[in-house]
C-alpha cells in the first residue's frame, strides 16, 4: 500500500479544514493554554520502528475522531467543516486499516508498540480531562483544536518509518 503518499495528502486536507474551523483568535485564549505532552513530538523518530508506525498512526487518528465526533464537539464547531474534517479522518483510518491488514503476518509488531499506543491514549485522556475541567468552553475547544492540529502535523514525521517498509 502506498501509505506515505496517500496519508500525506489526506493529512494536508484534514489540517487545512481543521485550521478553517478556528472560531476564536488564539491570543484571546492564552489563559487556557495547556501543554498536553504530545508523545510523538518528544520521542526520537528512530524509536518508532516501521512495524509500529501504522498502529500508532491509526490510534492517533481514531482518538482524534472520537474527540471530534463527541456530542460536546458538535456543539462547538461549524457543522459543515466538522463533517468534512471527520470524513477526512475516516478515510485516513480506512487507509491505515487496509495497510495494517496487509502488514499482519508479514512481520510481528514489536512489543515496544504497546508503549507508543499507551502513550497516545494517555495523551488523549489528558485532553478529554482538560475539556471536562474547562466545561467544554469555547476557549478550551480552541486550545484543543490548536493542539490536535500540531499533533496531526507532527504525525507526518512517522512517514519515513513507513517508507522504509518498501525498501
Amino acid at each position: 500500500c502506498d501509505l506515505p503518499h496517500t496519508y500525506n495528502l489526506r493529512n494536508k486536507r484534514a489540517l487545512k479544514v481543521l485550521a478553517q474551523m478556528r472560531r476564536l483568535p488564539f491570543l484571546s485564549c492564552l489563559k487556557d493554554r495547556q501543554d498536553f505532552g504530545f508523545p510523538l513530538e518528544k520521542v526520537d523518530n528512530q524509536q518508532i520502528q516501521k512495524a509500529q508506525a501504522i498502529p500508532v498512526l491509526r490510534d492517533l487518528t481514531q482518538q482524534t475522531l472520537n474527540l471530534f465526533t463527541s456530542k460536546a464537539s458538535s456543539a462547538a464547531w461549524n457543522a459543515t467543516l466538522l463533517d468534512s474534517f471527520c470524513n477526512d479522518l475516516h478515510q485516513q483510518l480506512n487507509d491505515l486499516q487496509t495497510c495494517l491488514m496487509q502488514q499482519v503476518g508479514v512481520q510481528e509488531p514489536p512489543l515496544t508498540q504497546e508503549d507508543a499506543l499507551l502513550a497516545v491514549r494517555k495523551y488523549f485522556h489528558r485532553i478529554t480531562v482538560y475539556l471536562r475541567e474547562k466545561k467544554h468552553s469555547p476557549c478550551a475547544w480552541e486550545v484543543v483544536r490548536a493542539e490536535v492540529w500540531r499533533a496531526l502535523s507532527s504525525s507526518v514525521n512517522l512517514l519515513p518509518r513507513l517508507s522504509e517498509e518498501k525498501e
Epitope: 501543554d35 505532552g37 508498540q113 508503549d115 507508543a116 499507551l118 494517555k122 489528558r126
Partner: antibody, heavy 122, light 107 residues
Framework: EMQLMESGGGLVQPGGSLRLSCVAS????????MSWVRQAPGKGLEWVAS????????YYAPSVKGRFSISRDNSNNTLYVQMNSLGVEDTAFYYC???????????????WGQGTLVIVST | DIRVTQSPSSLSASVGDRVSISCQTS??????LNWYQQRPGKGPQLLIS???TLQSGVPSRFSGSGSGTDFILTIISLQPEDSASYYC?????????FGQGTKVEIK
C-alpha cells in the same frame, strides 16, 4: 523484597562517557516504566529520562537530550543509561526509579534505588 | 516545561506541631502531583501520589490535598523521624519537574 541496585558510577573527565546499570528485583520489571533521576550533592532532584515498560516511548530532560540514552533489558531485569559528552554539571547521585505505570506521564515514582555517584572532573 | 514552585524552602517546628508545605504548578496538572520524603543520606521515598493518595506504610499523619495548580502537604502532628527534605513533583507530562524542596527541622 522490592529492590533497585545501581552501579557504574565513578570519576570521569569532562567530555567522557559512562554507562550506569540498575538491576531490579522483587517485582515484575517488564510491566513498569523506569526512570533515572539525579541529584547534585546538596541540591534538589532532577528527572533525567524515562523508558516505557517494553523499551519504547523514551523521554529525556532537555538538559541531557542528545547526550544520554536510556534503555532496558527485560530478560535480565536491568535498566541502563549511556551518558556521553559529560560535563561538570552532570556531577550527581543518579537514582534508578520505578514508575507506577507502563509508560511515563500521569503517574508517580514509587520506588527508588540508593543511587550511584557520578563525578565529572579533571 | 511545567514549572513547580514549592514553599517554604525550610521550616523549623516542634514535635506535635501541624506543618504545611505548599506546591504550585505553572499549568494545571489535574491531580498528578506527588510528594516525596528524603531523609539525610538516603534515596527519596514516595509519600503521596495523585495529590492525596497515601502510599502503603506511610503514617496517617501525612495528608495531601489540592488539584489543578495548587497543592498542600500537611503533617498533622510532627514527629522526630519527620526531620527530612520534602519534594513535590508533577507527574502529568514529561519532562517531570520537581519543586526546589522544603527542609523540615525539629526545634
Amino acid at each position: 523484597e522490592m529492590q533497585l541496585m545501581e552501579s557504574g558510577g565513578g570519576l570521569v573527565q569532562p567530555g567522557g562517557s559512562l554507562r550506569l546499570s540498575c538491576v531490579a528485583s522483587g517485582f515484575t520489571f517488564k510491566s513498569f516504566a523506569m526512570s533515572w533521576v539525579r541529584q547534585a550533592p546538596g541540591k534538589g532532584l532532577e528527572w533525567v529520562a524515562s523508558v516505557g515498560s517494553q523499551g519504547g516511548s523514551k523521554y529525556y530532560a532537555p538538559s541531557v537530550k542528545g547526550r544520554f540514552s536510556i534503555s532496558r533489558d527485560n530478560s535480565n531485569n536491568t535498566l541502563y543509561v549511556q551518558m556521553n559528552s559529560l560535563g561538570v554539571e552532570d556531577t550527581a547521585f543518579y537514582y534508578c526509579v520505578k514508575e507506577t505505570d507502563a509508560v511515563a506521564t500521569m503517574d508517580a515514582l514509587d520506588m527508588w534505588g540508593q543511587g550511584t555517584l557520578v563525578i565529572v572532573s579533571t | 516545561d511545567i514549572r513547580v514552585t514549592q514553599s517554604p524552602s525550610s521550616l523549623s517546628a516542634s514535635v506535635g506541631d501541624r506543618v504545611s508545605i505548599s506546591c504550585q504548578t505553572s499549568q494545571s496538572v489535574n491531580i498528578y502531583l506527588n510528594w516525596y520524603q528524603q531523609r539525610p543520606g538516603k534515596g527519596p521515598q514516595l509519600l503521596i501520589s495523585a495529590a492525596s493518595t497515601l502510599q502503603s506504610g506511610v503514617p496517617s499523619r501525612f495528608s495531601g490535598s489540592g488539584s489543578g495548580t495548587d497543592f498542600i502537604l500537611t503533617i498533622i502532628s510532627l514527629q522526630p523521624e519527620d526531620s527530612a527534605s520534602y519534594y513535590c513533583q508533577q507527574g502529568y507530562i514529561t519532562p517531570y519537574t520537581f519543586g526546589q524542596g522544603t527542609k523540615v527541622e525539629i526545634k
